[in-house]
Interface confidence: medium
């Protein structure tokens, strides 16, 4: 059975979109209605994990290329990073935990939790141009995403 | 308490076949998360990964044994099987079968092996 | 495939000494790794599990750090009972590959 996957962008609570700055790293920033298509559209992939009533475990690849979203330990803390993968491999239905992420729906906004880091959350700064980053919701943080599908 | 045992390990001829049998107790391969994998060891040599099967069914082989040989389960007999055809010299080893859960693949209880000889 | 490296295949070391046993990774495995003890004869048993976390049961003396491509098994105060086979095992992609073992030999 091949692995189901839908194709979404996401902008953050503050409407700024996400963008693929270097070959690994993905950047949050208001794009005006001429760059528009520079957001990276994201491959969700619903795979092997944990599901509960408010938690669907999914993974996140960036359409059209081998990479996805993980989460590792770095230096004593839960990071994020791009990962290339084998596309002969990947997406598959039992991702490694790395790879996976508790799709958490809050009203009309999503939260997207480390599966391997509990309490960690994809995030964004409040300022523009910094990286998308793996934070444990304290401060200013942004944590909640809206997803817009786009067709396959 | 965990207990994993080999066996169906002998001499064979180069070419023949082999099942080897990993009857365990103390854990259930119905259980979600739950992986048994066979490893070997060639005499005097480090430990290889064989080939591993999930709880649900999903399977994973190394290159050098995928297409030759076949892991599969019986939940009912609490066993893990190694079919292994067409075989080399360099599969002489004492296989190992172990236990871990799905991801990351830590292998946390092991069987004592069983020798392969391939030989003529 | 990503190849695992234990330099040192054999290592002379005496009762009370602190042993440094070394892996390296071909790439970056994010702290995918586990260390194993071999004697010949018993089970394999996990030591360390994560890079760093200790199985249950096993003596606080062995304790594992590491991360990127280099990671190390260290164990404070040799006892008898240590004398044995030491592998690391990566577990970040298939195929999960294994050092090829580092021989911890009384001196």
């Known amino acids: 059975v091949p692995i189901r996957q839908l194709h979404y962008r996401l902008r953050d609570e503050q409407q700024k979109s996400l963008v693929l700055s270097d070959p690994y790293e993905l950047k949050a920033l208001h794009l005006n209605g001429q760059n528009i298509n520079q957001q990276v559209i994201f491959s969700m992939s619903f795979v092997q994990g944990e599901p509960s009533n408010d938690k669907i475990p999914v993974a996140l690849g960036l359409k059209g290329k081998n990479l996805y979203l993980s989460c590792v330990m770095k230096d004593g803390t839960p990071t994020l990073q791009l990962e290339s993968v084998d596309p002969k491999q990947y997406p598959k239905k039992k991702m490694e935990k790395r790879f996976v992420f508790n799709k958490i729906e809050v009203k009309s906004k999503v939260e997207f939790e480390s599966a391997e880091f509990p309490n960690w959350y994809i995030s964004t700064s409040q300022a523009e141009h910094k990286p998308v980053f793996l934070g444990n919701n304290s401060g200013q943080d942004i944590i909640d995403f809206t997803m817009e599908s786009v067709s396959s | 308490q965990v207990q994993l045992v080999e066996s169906g390990g002998g001499v064979v001829q180069p070419g023949r076949s082999l099942r080897l049998s990993c009857a365990f107790s103390g854990f259930s391969l119905s259980t979600s998360g739950m992986g048994v994998g066979w490893i070997r060891q060639a005499p005097g040599k480090g430990l290889e990964w064989v080939a591993h099967?999930?709880?649900?069914?999903?399977?994973s082989y190394a290159d050098s044994v995928k297409g030759r040989f076949t892991i599969s389960k019986d939940n009912s007999k609490n066993t893990v099987y190694l079919q292994m055809n067409s075989l080399r010299a360099e599969d002489t080893a004492v296989y190992f079968c172990?236990?871990?859960?799905?991801?990351?693949?830590?292998?946390?209880?092991w069987g004592q092996g069983t020798l392969v000889t391939v030989s003529s | 495939d990503i190849q695992m490296t234990q330099s040192t295949s054999s290592l002379s070391a005496s009762v009370g000494d602190r042993v440094t046993i070394t892996c390296r990774a071909s790439q970056d495995i994010s702290n995918y790794l586990s260390w194993y003890q071999q004697k010949p004869g018993k089970a394999v048993k996990l030591l360390i599990y994560y890079t760093s976390k200790l199985h249950s049961g096993v003596p606080s003396r062995f304790s594992g750090s590491g991360s990127g491509t280099d990671y190390t098994l260290t164990i404070s105060s040799l006892q008898q009972e240590d004398f044995a086979t030491y592998f690391c095992?990566?577990?970040?992609?298939?195929?999960?590959?294994f050092g090829q073992g580092t021989k911890l030999e009384i001196k």
């Open positions: 099967i999930w709880w649900d069914g999903d399977e």
């Open positions: 172990a236990r871990n859960r799905y991801d990351p693949p830590w292998f946390v209880d």
């Open positions: 095992l990566q577990g970040k992609m298939l195929p999960w590959t």
